[in-house]
């Protein structure tokens, strides 16, 4: 070994200076007699080395690095040898920080593993190997006097927690506990905890279960859940309080907390929930009134609340078959009476014969919004209910009565936009209780079964905007019937379009006669089409070879036209435009040539 480095300290505070000396022995005679010692930190040459020859012939270079800003680096002492740098010796330098005081030390007692688990936050990175030790002692009092020491607990590398096993614990007796952090630059200690392991006990949560329905127990009310829990048996002797949390499975709702519940409640009816909704529930417990830690939340239990009977008003409307007046088609619409009006599973129409107490005969049971049934001859009234698994809505009576009320007058309809129609009327006297408005395709597509209907509850209304099932270019029949206390008025009807269509094509032009300066044209008008506006007029256009255009407007009843003032022996392009209020369409172009001056007229 020709050279040897010694340093003031191999480990320093990051940013602190460091001094190193390198001595080259005299017996390295193969070297230059006055060798220049160079210093390198990592890969970089470091200036500032002070070199001297000592009395024994050795060469010494001393360097002070003012700030060691690398957490780890190699310092090398070198010589130039030929064209390369020869390393004579090197040392590893390390820089970092003394350990910060470990903080947030906390412990919990696990009664299943019979160990006290303590964890802490080690603080910022020291950049140096730092060991942590959980230290503790038993104490009779409040940890002012130290009793027996407990074996140090050393966590596995990189871990910030450690378990003190049962054999080192004394329950119901205080322990002093702290963390010591140590590295080459110093030692630090966390504030000491003084605790009885039982005061930091963390229990296992109960297991939530659904309650087995018993025959004598009443079923849960709508929006309620009946549940029970199986406590963690080993913890049952510990007084605890528990809390339950729940949230609907769907949607973004946050957890709602219910508590405190005594652990011993063992069963519970949770109410005030949404009916017919799936909920996720969890429970946790804590030693109480003595100190402790909350248990983890239990595994989830998923339960569905019972639904509530439908709370709806059923608006009804009916129609008799013309060929068989005892066959009735009944229509209805559910109108929610509350925000959550309950799920509707189906509808039942029933009739109670007079003189048969309690006997109810179902006429139909359906999930649709209408049904057709044969009305018994003595029946003047039926009852309609909506139902689900929780029960039925209040029955809606439907009375089948003659049309004895006054009719409304001046029924009219007009388009609002392509998808709505306004129907208006003059109310009769006395005012009706309301109206039924029906609408559907008019002839030729008319069908009773495909009609849409609405109930207008306001008897003083003078119109209604139809927004459902209205399409442009279709003819609609709109029927309005006034409703009275025990009867109805005669139905009135009107036809209307929400938007009419331009003519689909204009008639074809035909040449009937032609001369030198005139041409007689004719056409067959298109038959009127439903959904299309009637024609308002025709316009005929003709263009000569010089691209001059001429036109004439003709009334809608025209069937022909004579073009005058044409040039002989000239080419003309002619087309017809058919127009209505909804737009216009052009015919195909007819091309013709007038006769030469010496030619005879063609008829």
């Amino acid at each position: 070994e020709c050279g040897h480095i010694s340093v003031s300290a191999p480990i320093v505070h990051l940013g602190d200076p460091i001094t190193a000396s390198c001595i080259i022995k005299q017996n390295c005679s193969h070297l230059d007699p006055e060798p220049q010692i160079l210093w390198r930190l990592g890969a970089e040459l470091q200036p500032g080395g002070r070199q001297q020859r000592l009395s024994d012939g050795t060469q010494e270079s001393i360097i002070t690095l003012p700030h060691l800003n690398h957490t780890q680096a190699f310092l090398s002492c070198c010589l130039n040898w030929g064209n390369s740098l020869q390393i004579l010796d090197q040392v590893e330098l390390r820089a970092g920080y003394p350990p910060a005081i470990p903080h947030n030390l906390s412990c919990l007692m696990n009664l299943t593993t019979s160990s006290l688990i303590c964890q802490w936050e080690p603080g910022p990175e020291t950049h140096l190997p730092t060991s942590f030790t959980l230290k503790s002692f038993k104490s009779r009092g409040n940890c002012q006097t130290q009793g027996d020491s407990i074996l140090d607990c050393v966590p596995k590398d990189g871990q910030s927690h450690c378990c003190i096993p049962r054999k080192h614990l004394l329950l119901y007796q205080n322990m002093g506990i702290w963390v010591q952090a140590e590295n080459a630059l110093g030692t630090s200690m966390s504030p000491q905890l003084c605790l009885d392991p039982m005061d930091v006990v963390k229990l296992e949560p109960p297991m939530l279960r659904t309650m087995d329905p018993s025959p004598e127990a009443a079923p849960p009310q709508a929006g309620c859940l009946q549940l029970c829990w199986e406590p963690w048996q080993p913890g049952l002797h510990i007084n605890q309080k528990c809390e339950l949390r729940h949230k609907p499975q769907r949607g973004e709702a946050s957890w709602a907390l219910v508590g405190p519940l005594p652990l011993e409640a063992l069963q519970y009816e949770l109410c005030g929930l949404l009916p017919a909704t799936a909920y996720t529930l969890q429970i946790r417990c804590i030693r109480w009134p003595l100190p402790g830690h909350w248990s983890d939340w239990s595994p989830s239990l998923e339960l569905r609340t019972t639904e509530r009977a439908p709370t709806v008003r059923l608006d009804t409307w009916w129609r008799q078959r013309q060929l068989d007046p005892r066959t009735v088609q009944l229509f209805w619409k559910p109108v929610p009476l509350e925000e959550d009006s309950g799920r509707i599973q189906g509808y039942v129409v029933s009739w109670r014969p007079s003189g048969q107490a309690g006997a109810i005969l179902p006429l139909c049971n359906t999930t649709e919004l209408s049904c057709t049934f044969h009305l018994p001859s003595e029946a003047q009234e039926v009852a309609l209910v909506a139902y689900n698994s929780a029960g039925t809505s209040r029955p809606t009576p439907v009375v089948f009565s003659e049309s004895r009320g006054p009719a409304l007058t001046r029924l009219h309809a007009m388009a609002r936009d392509p998808h709505s129609l306004w129907v208006g009327w003059e109310p009769p006297n006395p005012w009706p209780q309301g109206y039924v408005i029906e609408w559907g395709l008019g002839p030729p597509s008319a069908s009773n079964s495909n009609k849409t209907w609405r109930m207008e509850q306001n008897g003083r209304a003078t119109g209604f905007l139809l927004k459902e099932n209205i399409r442009p270019f279709q003819l609609y029949e709109i029927i309005v019937t006034p409703l009275y206390q025990d009867t109805m008025g005669p139905s009135q009807h009107v036809y209307a379009y929400s938007q009419e269509m331009a003519p689909s094509h204009a008639p074809e032009l035909h040449l009937k006669h032609i001369g030198k300066t005139w041409a007689q044209l004719e056409w067959v008008p298109e038959p009127p089409e439903l959904g299309k506006s009637p024609l308002t007029h025709y316009t005929i256009f003709w263009t000569n070879a010089q691209n001059q255009s001429f036109s004439a407007i003709l009334n809608a009843s025209s069937r022909g036209f004579v073009l005058h003032g044409l040039e002989p022996a000239s080419l003309y392009h002619i087309h017809l435009m058919a127009a209505s209020q909804a737009g216009a369409t052009n015919s195909t172009v007819l091309t013709l040539m007038t006769l030469t001056p010496e030619g005879s007229e063609l008829h």
Partner: antibody, heavy 118, light 107 residues
Amino acid sequence: EVQLLESGGGLVQPGGSLRLSCAASGFTFSLYWMGWVRQAPGKGLEWVSSISSSGGVTPYADSVKGRFTISRDNSKNTLYLQMNSLRAEDTAVYYCAKLGELGQSMLWGQGTLVTVSS
Amino acid sequence: DIQMTQSPSSLSASVGDRVTITCRASQGISSYLNWYQQKPGKAPKLLIYYASNLQNGVPSRFSGSGSGTDFTLTISSLQPEDFATYYCQQSWQIKLKFGGGTKVEIK
């Protein structure tokens, strides 16, 4: 002074009933589970029943289930054991015990003798 | 239900002897095991709870160890007042079963 005092033991015919009481003093009775343990003459200890601090949980040994009922009155600091349909094999010294949080019987009464014999 | 088996059912020993009594549970009970001492005509007395915790006022010659299913009560140096019957009891389940007992007699 912390103590438990049993009473109500005595001689009873098979099929008869007896009610044991245990008066507690010196500690907050309502915070602790309590229990009954019995010992037949010349035999070992047999746990009979326990009751939670508020009385909501009451486990029983299979040998007495359906015949014995444990109860407590926290306002009177008293524990009870109602014994019905008594059998000869129920003859024993009945001890009242205060239970700790880990199920240990921390404190025992002096015992009361129940003899079931015709 | 958990069954508790104690062994031996009886033993003879002299003052100063080290005495070991074992208790086995039919299933794992963590550390939920308690030891009691009973002298003739007296109520039992709690010695050790939660497998190894010495009850207040109990001499330190008594110690407990074990977890899971196998447990031991050790009297490091038997004293004249220690001749009695010793019982183990599990409290993992709320049906608190006792072992059959071990009678420690003077040799």
